[in-house]
């Protein structure tokens, strides 16, 4: 059967919006009018993972782009990064791990952990227009609540 | 009121370890990345490394090769940094600071001065 | 390694006058930085984050400017209690996190 998706825009908790900035990131920023055009529009797909009640696993595309957020080591870090794919086999139901994210739902709120590096999280920063980051904290100055708006196919 | 309240003042000998402590309080300490930042006499700031309590990651200087070891302990919420191996030019006032993921260290503790000295 | 160079080295500045620092990244870190300001024998102060970011509890004669590669920071009216170093440091790429050598600030 054929994986699953649907259509999303993601918003942090302190209503900023992602856009792409460059060909390989996103930053989060504030948006207005007619300006949220800007947002980027995700292809959330339900994947093969650990789940439970609270918590599904799943890929974050970009809408009509062969990119995918992704999860990797650089210099030692666990790193959020955009990674290109071949449309030809992507989105599918088993997704390696890297490409992962559990969402969590708690309080009306989503967190989206790294499915490779646990207890690291899609965050932003307070600061305005800062690029979008694999942070390793919760509950402190960065960002990791976010509120989902489904845009129709 | 955020506090970072470090250990006392320590004179080793060469070849020998420290091991510093900051006690942090009035805030989440599993909220925040927390560094350690080194100051030689009559010298600059040098990053020396960082722990993130949530997750016990640890990343620090190359220059420091191994010697730095940095661990925390949340029920205390207090973060620990030793380093090992001391030569006279580890000689420093040692700070440690809480931050954000870009770095902003909006508190810091007092400082710890490490003599080594034969 | 991101360097971070700041000019100049000292810095002379007359009471009430406007004394500008200068922060030059290797490469560009967008508005990943942050300013400090250390006096005799205490820790350094976080003065300005973001670039151009205020600081509660930091007077307004303190300001940030700049992206990319080229910073600085401005103290619009000097006044005797600024006599410090002034350090920048990046957090655009880490590890390592990396400050510039300073600038000592003195009253001509």
């Known amino acids: 059967a054929p994986v699953r998706s649907l259509n999303c825009t993601l918003r942090d908790s302190q209503q900023k919006s992602l856009v792409m900035s460059g060909p390989y990131e996103l930053k989060a920023l504030h948006l207005q009018g007619q300006d949220m055009e800007q947002q980027v529009v995700f292809s959330m797909s339900f994947v093969q993972g650990e789940e439970s009640n609270d918590k599904i696993p799943v890929a974050l595309g970009l809408k009509e782009k062969n990119l995918y957020l992704s999860c990797v080591l650089k210099d030692d870090k666990p790193t959020l990064q955009l990674e290109s794919v071949d449309p030809k086999n992507y989105p599918k139901k088993k997704m390696e791990k890297r490409f992962v994210f559990n969402k969590i739902e708690i309080n009306n709120k989503l967190e989206f952990e790294s499915a490779q590096f646990p207890n690291w999280y899609i965050s932003t920063s307070q600061a305005e227009n800062m690029p979008v980051f694999l942070g390793g904290t919760k509950g402190g100055q960065d960002i990791t609540d976010f509120t989902m708006q489904f845009v129709s196919s | 009121e955020v506090q970072l309240v470090q250990s006392g003042a320590e004179v080793k000998k060469p070849g020998a370890s420290v091991k510093v402590s900051c006690k942090a309080s009035?805030?989440?300490?599993?909220?925040?990345?927390m560094h350690w930042v080194r100051q030689a006499p009559g010298q600059g700031l040098e990053w020396v490394g960082l722990?993130?309590?949530?997750?016990?990651?640890?990343v620090n200087n190359q220059k420091f090769k191994g010697r730095v070891t940095m661990t925390r302990d949340t029920s205390t919420s207090t973060a620990y940094m030793e380093l090992s191996s001391l030569r006279s030019e580890d000689t420093a006032v040692y700070y440690c600071?809480?931050?954000?993921?870009?770095?902003?260290?909006?508190?810091w503790g007092q400082g710890t001065l490490v003599t080594v000295s034969s | 390694e991101i360097v971070m160079t700041q000019s100049p080295a000292t810095l002379s500045v007359s009471p009430g006058e406007r004394a500008t620092l200068s922060c030059r990244a290797s490469q560009n870190i967008g508005t990943s930085i942050h300013w400090y300001q250390q006096k005799p024998g205490q820790a350094p102060r976080l003065l300005i984050k973001?670039?151009?970011n205020s600081i509660y509890g930091i007077p307004a004669r303190f300001s940030g400017s700049g992206s990319g590669t080229e910073f600085t920071l401005t103290i619009s009216s000097l006044q005797s209690e600024d006599i410090a170093v002034y350090y920048c440091q990046q957090g655009a790429s880490w590890p390592p996190f990396t400050f510039g050598q300073g600038t000592k600030l003195e009253i001509k």
């Open positions: 009035g805030f989440s300490f599993t909220g925040y990345y």
């Open positions: 722990i993130i309590p949530h997750n016990d990651y640890t």
């Open positions: 600071a809480r931050s954000d993921y870009y770095g902003a260290m909006d508190y």
């Open positions: 973001y670039a151009s």
